[in-house]
Interface confidence: medium
């Protein structure tokens, strides 16, 4: 269950300010002495971190991935888990910490000196839980080793947003992922609905840039739910 995971060091989310004031995305977050999780009669410490629920890896931090906290992958909520370091087991790239990727079920360094020429990678994106794959849409993609030494430019194949240059994010494009521009003010964005999964977006957009959020365009309020246009707007 999630309770047992919370008692380990697996959950690595920033602690809340005990003062209780709502913070700002850029503000510092003060450390709490410990968050406790009520588990029956016994209280369990979470080592200063709280579980952060997620639906996909992009909702987590750069050093995290989204998965069920239990081995069996129960039907409950998925949370952001700390990324796996080198030589740890993995099932997909996002599970491995930046600078590593998943090869043959193990996180390996993606910037080793002996890398020459090209490496072949199977990019399998996970939807729903840790053990699901894209129903056979596993695409073999050739990645240049240069990708691991310099930040990817627009159109470069990537594994995660940290592989991309500033102003770009790693987003799905067909069955692969490439660096795409972070959305600017006024650009159309995708607003996922809380009910139901995010679905399969084969042409995924980046998120809105800092200081922007994805909202219904003012003149589209009267439109039907399904046809409402969302754009990146100032907070």
């Amino acid at each position: 269950t999630l309770n047992s995971v919370l008692n380990s060091n697996a959950i690595k989310n920033l602690p809340p300010p005990l003062g209780g004031a709502a913070g700002h995305p850029g503000s510092a977050v003060s450390a709490a002495p410990g968050i406790l999780y009520p588990g029956g009669n016994k209280y369990q410490t979470i080592d200063n971190y709280q579980p952060y629920p997620c639906a996909e890896d992009e909702e987590c931090g750069t050093d995290e991935y989204c998965a069920s906290p239990t081995r069996g992958g129960d039907a409950g909520v998925q949370i952001c888990l700390a990324c796996r370091k080198r030589r740890k087991r993995c099932m997909r790239h996002a599970m491995c910490c930046p600078g590593n990727y998943c090869k043959n079920g193990i996180c390996v360094s993606s910037d080793q000196n002996h890398f020459r020429g090209e490496i072949e990678e199977t990019i399998t994106e996970s939807f729903g839980n840790d053990h699901s794959t894209l129903d056979g849409y596993s695409r073999r993609t050739t990645l240049s080793s240069k990708m691991y030494h310099t930040k990817g430019q627009e159109g470069s194949v990537c594994l995660r947003s940290s592989d991309c240059a500033s102003g770009l994010c790693c987003a799905r494009h067909f069955w692969s992922k490439i660096c795409k521009p972070v959305l600017k003010e006024g650009q159309v964005c995708t607003k996922h609905r809380r009910k139901g999964s995010h679905g399969l977006e084969i042409f995924q957009r980046c998120y809105c840039g800092e200081g922007l959020s994805c909202r219904i365009q003012k003149d589209h309020h009267q439109a039907s739910n399904s046809s409402r246009l969302h754009t990146c707007q100032r907070h």
């Epitope: 920033l14 931090g61 409950g76 909520v77 952001c80 607003k191």
Partner: nanobody, 123 residues
């Protein structure tokens, strides 16, 4: 700036019910996870319930079957329906909204916090 305002707290008798609300502004509500935490006097803050952006929910063992977390995207509001309240549920209840992780370049996904609303269960 992200703002979260909780309401609905108060004094209730054991076995009674309360519905807490958390109005959010300054974030794309439906794309972020929400959580309810609580802090009893002299104790640490603890997790009560979570709801992910895809609607999946999770509850602390001590509140399972009694509390229900939900979210109304059209009102940018999260709720915590609390039934069969017990004296040990007495605490300040805090609403928390995830503000996204790698979207802002954070290495860890993080929460924004409301000021809290007091719930007292006593006869």
């Amino acid at each position: 700036e992200v703002q979260l305002v909780e309401s609905g707290g108060g004094l209730v008798q054991p076995g009674g019910s309360l519905r807490l609300s958390c109005a959010a502004s300054g974030l794309t509500f439906s794309t972020y996870p929400m959580g309810w935490f609580r802090q009893a006097p002299g104790k640490e803050r603890e997790l009560v319930a979570l709801i992910a952006s895809n609607g999946n929910t999770h509850y602390a063992d001590s509140v399972k079957g009694r509390f229900t977390i939900s979210a109304d995207n059209s009102k940018n509001t999260a709720y915590l329906q609390m039934n069969s309240l017990k004296p040990e549920d007495t605490a300040v209840y805090y609403c928390a909204a995830g503000n996204g992780g790698r979207a802002y370049g954070y290495s860890r996904a993080r929460y924004e916090w409301g000021q809290g609303t007091l719930v007292t269960v006593s006869s």
